[in-house]
């Protein structure tokens, strides 16, 4: 098992977290993605792709939007209004199969306080554990879909075991697989 | 000092490959992606992909998947572009290009350190 | 793709004068938009990220703004070192795409 170390992301409330998952075009791409959160020792589903298709469409649940870009190898989230208790740890993961998930990188540690909204400041970038101070520019965001259609994803499961090639990890029950709306 | 230093000109014919190298110094290259832009003489400027100099994962536009492969050493910081079956209207100044992020996942494609640029010339 | 038409292609303005240039996107970037000045035979320079924040050490007299689909460049009072072609970039959506470019010379 390879040990990941966590980032810390700081922001605002009513901000928007915006995160570029990437991974393996040649292993991936025709994978579904999914966005977690861990609830203690629990992985949570929040949000997960539809299966692939030559027309990608963008997967909206509540104020969390994924886009998977098979073609660029990335994807694309968006948490809008952040409030206090969206904080903990998130992590982007490739959802092959409710038993096998693979975690893409480093588990981003959210920490949303109470203050004015801005986009966080821009500074020489780190690698790890590295608070910002965000900047007093909002980052506006619109409603972006409509006309929304409504998925049904996969039944609950109680485990995932999540197999460990580079820098991926182990995790356990894995549970709350939700019902998704998909926006064209 | 922290830049991005790329290879000199080429002059290729039709149908051959070009590799263009950009060696990073100044700032630790596996923290950045790399990306590549083209412009044409006269042209726009036009993104052909990016690479994580990390775990070398790359994307591509469409109009250049099949023909363009972007690696890496990181031994001696250094990216590479490599675009293949070269055609005339591939004659252009190529960019590689920093993509600078507030933290190292954030969706933000800003560029703020650029090569100085490699012109490549397809001719018969 | 997101398409960005830049207006306009080219201008020319007195020095001191105030110049303003427009892009826009084909759908909604969320203020995900660069611009970037490019002088002739040196590579392009980031001014204003994120629709409206100014790079560091770039002149205050640059700015831009705007949401949704439209933005805005401007340059308060034009100066002879700013002569120089202008693009903007979008990242709201990929693959990333640039404007058409402005021109901009002065009489």
């Known amino acids: 098992t390879t040990e990941l170390t966590e980032e810390k992301y700081e922001y605002k409330e009513g901000q928007t977290l915006e995160v570029k998952c990437d991974y393996a075009l040649e292993k991936y791409a025709n994978s579904r993605k999914a966005w977690q959160k861990m609830e203690g020792k629990m992985p949570k589903i929040l949000a997960k792709t539809e299966r692939p298709s030559e027309n990608s469409h963008p997967v909206q649940v509540g104020r969390i939007t994924l886009e998977d870009y098979p073609d660029h190898g990335l994807l694309q989230v968006r948490m809008t209004n952040l409030q206090v208790e969206d904080s903990g740890l998130y992590q982007c993961v490739i959802y092959q199969h409710p038993k096998e998930s693979h975690v893409l990188f480093n588990p981003i540690c959210l920490v949303v306080t109470k203050g004015s909204s801005g986009t966080p400041g821009s500074s020489e970038n780190s690698t790890q554990n590295v608070y910002r101070t965000p900047s007093t520019t909002a980052k506006a965001l619109g409603p972006r879909y409509t006309s929304p259609r409504t998925v049904t994803q996969a039944p609950p499961e109680s485990t995932v075991v999540v197999s460990t090639p580079g820098s991926e990890i182990n995790l356990t029950n894995v549970t709350d697989i939700i019902r998704v709306p998909v926006f064209n | 000092q922290v830049q991005l230093v790329q290879s000199g000109a080429e002059v290729k014919k039709p149908g051959a490959s070009v590799k263009v190298s950009c060696k990073a110094s100044?700032?630790?290259?596996?923290?950045?992606?790399i990306n590549w832009v083209r412009q044409a003489t006269g042209q726009g400027l036009e993104w052909m992909g990016w690479?994580?100099?990390?775990?070398?994962?790359?994307g591509y536009v469409k109009k250049f998947q099949g023909r363009v492969t972007m690696t890496r050493n990181t031994s001696i910081s250094t990216a590479y572009m490599e675009l293949s079956s070269l055609r005339s209207e591939d004659t252009a100044v190529y960019y590689c290009?920093?993509?600078?992020?507030?933290?190292?996942?954030?969706?933000?494609?800003?560029?703020?350190?650029w090569g100085r640029g490699t012109l490549v010339t397809v001719s018969s | 793709d997101t398409q960005m038409t830049q207006s306009p292609s080219s201008l020319s303005a007195s020095e001191g004068d105030r110049v303003t240039i427009t892009c826009q996107a084909s759908?909604?970037?969320?203020?995900?938009l660069n611009w970037y000045q490019e002088k002739p035979g040196k590579a392009p320079k980031l001014l204003i990220y994120?629709?409206?924040n100014l790079e560091t050490g770039v002149p205050s007299r640059f700015s831009g703004s705007g949401s949704g689909t439209d933005y805005t460049f401007t340059i308060s009072s034009l100066q002879p070192e700013d002569i120089a072609t202008y693009y903007c970039?979008?990242?709201?959506?990929?693959?990333?795409?640039f404007g058409g470019g402005t021109k901009v010379e002065i009489k």
């Open positions: 290009a920093r993509r600078r992020a507030v933290y190292r996942s954030s969706w933000e494609w800003y560029f703020d350190l």
């Open positions: 100044g700032y630790t290259f596996t923290s950045y992606d």
């Open positions: 690479m994580n100099p990390n775990r070398g994962n790359t």
């Open positions: 759908q909604d970037i969320f203020n995900d």
């Open positions: 994120h629709a409206s």
């Open positions: 970039q979008q990242y709201g959506n990929l693959p990333l795409t």
